[in-house]
């Protein structure tokens, strides 16, 4: 049960952490104009990885897509790309998780496979987070290295009568939504390898073996003390394992294989 | 069409107060920035304040800051500008306007209300 | 706050000759994220309401004859109009629409010679 259930949350967490870095690498508000040296702008500035906007006091807003692709920074280009394999990453772990999800039946799918599954989109989801955050981490380094500059131009060469405003551009919306949700397809892939690990069967499964002792006629066989030597009725351990079927209960109760020496 | 029509305007002593009042018609008012524009007599035009669509935002010229207020009612499609510790300098045609128009420009303007501050 | 100087006050031009009016700002109305101007131009007749000519310190308002132009950027901005009418006889108008408070220039008297 609680397998399903860290599954599960898993699951919801990565496809909200995922939507997230959609909605992130979507949006335009990447960087936002720094109101500190005009606060009483009439004209507002914003950028996102795909186009810029300017928003006027009348209301209107006015945006213009990059149409260039060689004339783009390297860091712009290599934030779009981290942002995109996140999101292919993601879409794919999603895809993936769908059908490792124990609640799902799909054929006589075994519990095996669903954690191999169950694994690979936790992976995914750990690597599209890791890229998201990276890439929002870029931009935002970019962000910081470009502001002191810019504040650095502010300061020097203003000897002349006529004053000229250097548009300093700060952390967008954006930014807190990538991060936030980076965080959330990480922490949704580590609950999916979590969970993994109670998927899977932790014991190679044997045969029924007979290991003829010298002295005694007694017939060991994997699954529990059942025989004449007097251990007697161990009723968790009932169960003869002939490597066959089990059920969806008795997942976690069989001995692991280093019972067996 | 698009219609601006002050009111309130006349004859007050100094220090006393004043309320203009402007009706919109003609566009989706509560979408739209509002300006108070003034021009004394012979003189040239002189911006008084503005206030954003949602009323988040409120500007006024130095001249009138801590006098003059503005303030709006979409859903009485009005704009007002209340006008308190008025001096004969105040003396003017008061006009309301929109930006209506890109580039943050004052496309539609009203007729005017005259507002005299005299003893 | 941002300062226009307009210059000449009042110009005296021929009918079908050109008339230039400049306005200087005290503060660069340029905005790098849309490569604009934030200069406006109005006109306003005798015992009328200003009326809008030209927005983006170039672009001009639709309905406005051609005639009108604008130009100029950063701080230098200039109003042309290039074969005066009597009906261009009036008051001319920048105004800063970049920061508050929207200051406008002082007004250039336009009359025919």
């Known amino acids: 049960m609680a397998v399903t259930a860290c599954q599960g949350l898993g699951f919801v967490v990565s496809l909200i952490g995922i939507a997230g870095i959609i909605a992130a690498t979507c949006m335009d508000q990447w960087s936002t104009q720094d109101l500190y040296n005009n606060p009483v702008t009439a004209v507002f500035n914003y950028q996102g990885l795909w186009r810029s906007c300017v928003r006027e006091s009348s209301g209107f807003t006015e945006c213009r897509g990059y149409f260039t692709l060689l004339g783009l920074p390297a860091m712009l280009q290599a934030v779009r790309a981290l942002m995109i394999v996140g999101i292919v990453l993601g879409a794919i772990g999603l895809l993936v998780s769908i059908f490792a999800l124990k609640c799902i039946r799909i054929g006589s799918m075994e519990d095996s496979a669903k954690a191999n599954m169950t694994l690979t989109s936790g992976i995914m989801f750990i690597v599209s987070g890791l890229c998201a955050i990276a890439g929002v981490s870029v931009f935002a380094n970019m962000l910081v290295t470009n502001f002191w500059m810019s504040t650095a131009n502010m300061y020097t060469g203003m000897g002349g009568m006529v004053q000229t405003v250097q548009t300093r551009y700060t952390f967008g919306a954006a930014l807190f939504v990538g991060w936030v949700a980076g965080g959330l397809t990480l922490i949704g892939g580590v609950m999916m390898c979590i969970a993994c690990r109670g998927l899977a069967p932790e014991e190679t499964n044997y045969k029924a073996v007979s290991y003829h002792a010298s002295g005694h006629s007694v017939a060991y066989k994997p699954g529990g003390f059942k025989a004449s030597t007097g251990f007697g009725s161990n009723t968790k351990n009932k169960k003869i394992y002939d490597g066959g079927a089990r059920t969806e209960d008795e997942v976690q109760s069989y001995p692991s294989k280093h019972d067996y020496v | 069409e698009v219609q601006l029509v002050e009111s309130g305007g006349g004859l007050v002593q100094p220090g006393g107060s004043l309320r203009l009042s402007c009706a919109a018609s003609?566009?989706?008012?509560?979408?739209?920035?509002m300006h108070w524009v003034r021009q004394a007599p012979g003189k040239g035009l002189e911006w008084v304040s503005y206030?954003?669509?949602?009323?988040?935002?409120?500007y006024y010229a130095d001249t009138v800051k801590g006098r003059f207020t503005i303030s709006r009612d979409n859903a009485k499609n009005s704009l007002y500008l209340q006008m308190n510790s008025l001096r004969a300098e105040d003396t003017a045609v008061y006009y309301c306007?929109?930006?209506?128009?890109?580039?943050?420009?004052?496309?539609?303007w009203g007729q005017g209300t005259t507002v005299t501050v005299s003893s | 706050d941002v300062v226009l100087t307009q210059s000449p006050d009042s110009l005296a031009v021929s009918l079908g000759e050109r008339a230039t009016i400049n306005c200087k700002s005290s503060?660069?109305?340029?905005?790098?994220?849309?490569?604009?101007?934030?200069l406006t131009w109005y006109q306003q007749k005798p015992g009328q309401t200003p009326k809008l000519l030209i927005y983006?310190?170039?672009t001009r308002k639709s309905g406005v004859p051609d005639r009108f132009s604008g130009s100029g950027s950063g701080t230098d901005f200039t109003l042309t109009i290039s074969s005066l009418q009597a009906e261009d006889v009036a008051v001319y108008y920048c105004?800063?629409?970049?920061?508050?408070?929207?200051?406008f220039g002082g007004g250039t008297k336009v009359e025919i010679k």
């Open positions: 503060q660069s109305l340029f905005n790098v994220g849309n490569q604009k101007n934030y």
């Open positions: 983006w310190a170039s």
């Open positions: 003609g566009f989706t008012f509560s979408s739209f920035g």
């Open positions: 306007a929109t930006s209506y128009y890109y580039g943050n420009a004052l496309e539609y």
């Open positions: 206030i954003s669509s949602g009323s988040g935002s409120i």
């Open positions: 105004q800063n629409v970049y920061s508050y408070p929207l200051t």
